[in-house]
């Protein structure tokens, strides 16, 4: 299925706008921001997703806190250029001609340049660190529970193929969540770590992209896991390329 | 100690709606997940559907979709199933069930079950 | 869907026996998978849960192994009032579906 046919609305992606215009009246689903159509049986990418963000109202919210660490998405919210299959064109610029690289998650990945600067490819981001500090609780949540629970949870909320899902680290309150997925790996129709992680960072805000769904009330056993801080660390198939004065 | 405790037997006649109501007690009422399971004469389990009491969120098995209504009333601690379109072939007990439950709308286990509820669908 | 299969799908069996009951899921469940048993004119109670956990107050002569798409329940042995009909189901994703039970008869 595409999009749900009773309503003709888009299971995976609430910033869409549907209309029975399809082949055969069928229901057709276009990304708000960049008009192109989607395909609801599966994660919106995530550039599109952020383009369809950025055309809506109360657009001021940062992607991800600041850190001091390297590709942290340290700047915020931007209207990206996606190319026809929805992922980040490889140079992204803003209004004011200044123009930067970036990875297949949309992050920066050089020093910021000019219209000149070239970008020679989009380079893939194979691993994903994704750093939760949960809530205080009574006592630590058991490991295999914990590693189960979110292993379903990108399986079945997600569509992430359970072999990218590396590893789920836990040292309370910490818990890490490791995807990995290289270029050889990714199949057609597999669903994108970046993409992946973001529907989860969104879901961890409370602000879940899927239509008409829940929220995301995460718990393991019954017990509520309430995230109170979330970092995402992202590593390139290539290193980035800043300038030394970046890294003091 | 944790109980469900559901509303009497209900005959009903083709085309009519049941309303099934499930009063827990017990535990605290929105932090666990509530299950209808139904289970029709000489037969096998058949899930229905999970309410989540807290917010009220719902999944319904394909089956039942756009005849079965599950809401919740948190002043009562109550989970309440409506089935519309009635037919013979509903003719069942139908069990609410609690469940911890993982991240919604996952389930964990259904630990304790109400003591059914029998619908008689006849003309 | 994911279809879980039991089998068999009925059982004779003697007080003193040892009885494995198997399940068969469609696809991997990793260990979301639980066993009830159901007496005539009763609801059903959670006997095993997450493949091989034993619920509180349950007989230690039950017992529930696998992962993945094969499960075992076992009775180590047979007592008068497990004579029954026995489900398994799986907690993995909408919808949960049951096995079509197993229904164990005195021999």
């Known amino acids: 299925h595409t999009a749900a046919q009773d309503n003709c609305t888009c299971p995976t992606n609430k910033m869409t706008v549907c209309s029975p215009d399809g082949p055969g009246g069928r229901c057709q689903c276009r990304a708000l921001g960049s008009g192109m159509a989607v395909d609801c049986s599966t994660l919106t990418s995530k550039c599109l997703l952020l383009k369809a963000r950025m055309s809506a109202p109360k657009n001021a919210r940062t992607l991800v806190r600041p850190s001091e660490h390297a590709l942290v998405d340290n700047d915020g919210l931007y209207d990206p250029d996606c190319d026809p299959e929805g992922r980040f064109k490889a140079r992204q610029c803003n209004q004011t001609s200044v123009c930067w690289c970036v990875n297949s998650v949309g992050v920066r990945r050089t020093d910021k340049g000019d219209l000149s600067l070239r970008c020679d490819e989009l380079v893939r981001t194979h691993h994903i660190l994704i750093d939760l500090r949960h809530r205080p609780t009574a006592g630590a949540f058991n490991h295999s529970d914990l590693d189960a629970e979110l292993r379903r949870l990108f399986r079945e909320r997600y569509r992430l193929h359970p072999k990218f899902v590396a590893a789920v680290h836990y040292e309370q309150p910490t818990i890490q969540i490791e995807l990995r997925q290289n270029t050889s790996q990714k199949a057609a129709g597999d669903v994108d770590i970046g993409d992946a992680a973001y529907y989860f960072e969104r879901d961890i805000k409370g602000e879940s992209l899927f239509q008409g769904r829940g929220g995301l009330d995460l718990r393991v056993r019954g017990e509520p896991l309430q995230v109170e801080r979330t970092l995402i660390y992202y590593l390139d198939e290539i290193p980035p390329k800043f300038s030394m004065k970046r890294l003091t | 100690q944790v109980q469900l405790v559901q509303s009497g037997a209900e005959v009903k006649k083709p085309g009519a709606s049941v309303k099934v109501s499930c009063k827990a007690s017990?535990?605290?009422?929105?932090?666990?997940?509530m299950h209808w399971v139904r289970q029709a004469p000489g037969q096998g389990l058949e899930w229905m559907g999970i309410?989540?009491?807290?917010?009220?969120?719902?999944v319904y098995a394909q089956k039942f979709q756009g005849r079965v209504t599950m809401t919740r009333d948190t002043s009562t601690s109550t989970v309440y199933m409506e089935l519309s379109s009635l037919r013979s072939e509903d003719t069942a007990v139908y069990y609410c069930?609690?469940?911890?439950?993982?991240?919604?709308?996952?389930?964990?286990?259904?630990?304790?079950w109400g003591q059914g509820t029998l619908v008689t669908v006849s003309s | 869907d994911i279809q879980m299969t039991q089998s068999p799908s009925s059982l004779s069996a003697s007080v003193g026996d040892r009885v494995t009951i198997t399940c068969r899921a469609s696809?991997?469940?990793?260990?979301?998978l639980n066993w009830y048993q159901q007496k005539p004119g009763k609801a059903p109670k959670l006997l095993i849960y997450a493949a091989s956990s034993l619920q509180s107050g349950v007989p230690s002569r039950f017992s529930g192994s696998g992962s993945g798409t094969d499960f075992t329940l076992t009775i180590s042995s047979l007592q008068p009032e497990d004579f029954a009909t026995y489900y398994c189901?799986?907690?993995?994703?909408?919808?949960?579906?049951f096995g079509q039970g197993t229904k164990l008869e005195i021999k």
């Open positions: 189901q799986q907690s993995y994703s909408t919808p949960y579906t």
């Open positions: 017990g535990y605290t009422f929105t932090g666990s997940y």
């Open positions: 069930a609690r469940d911890p439950g993982g991240s919604w709308p996952f389930s964990y286990a259904l630990d304790y």
């Open positions: 696809q991997s469940i990793s260990s979301y």
């Open positions: 309410i989540n009491p807290s917010g009220e969120s719902t």
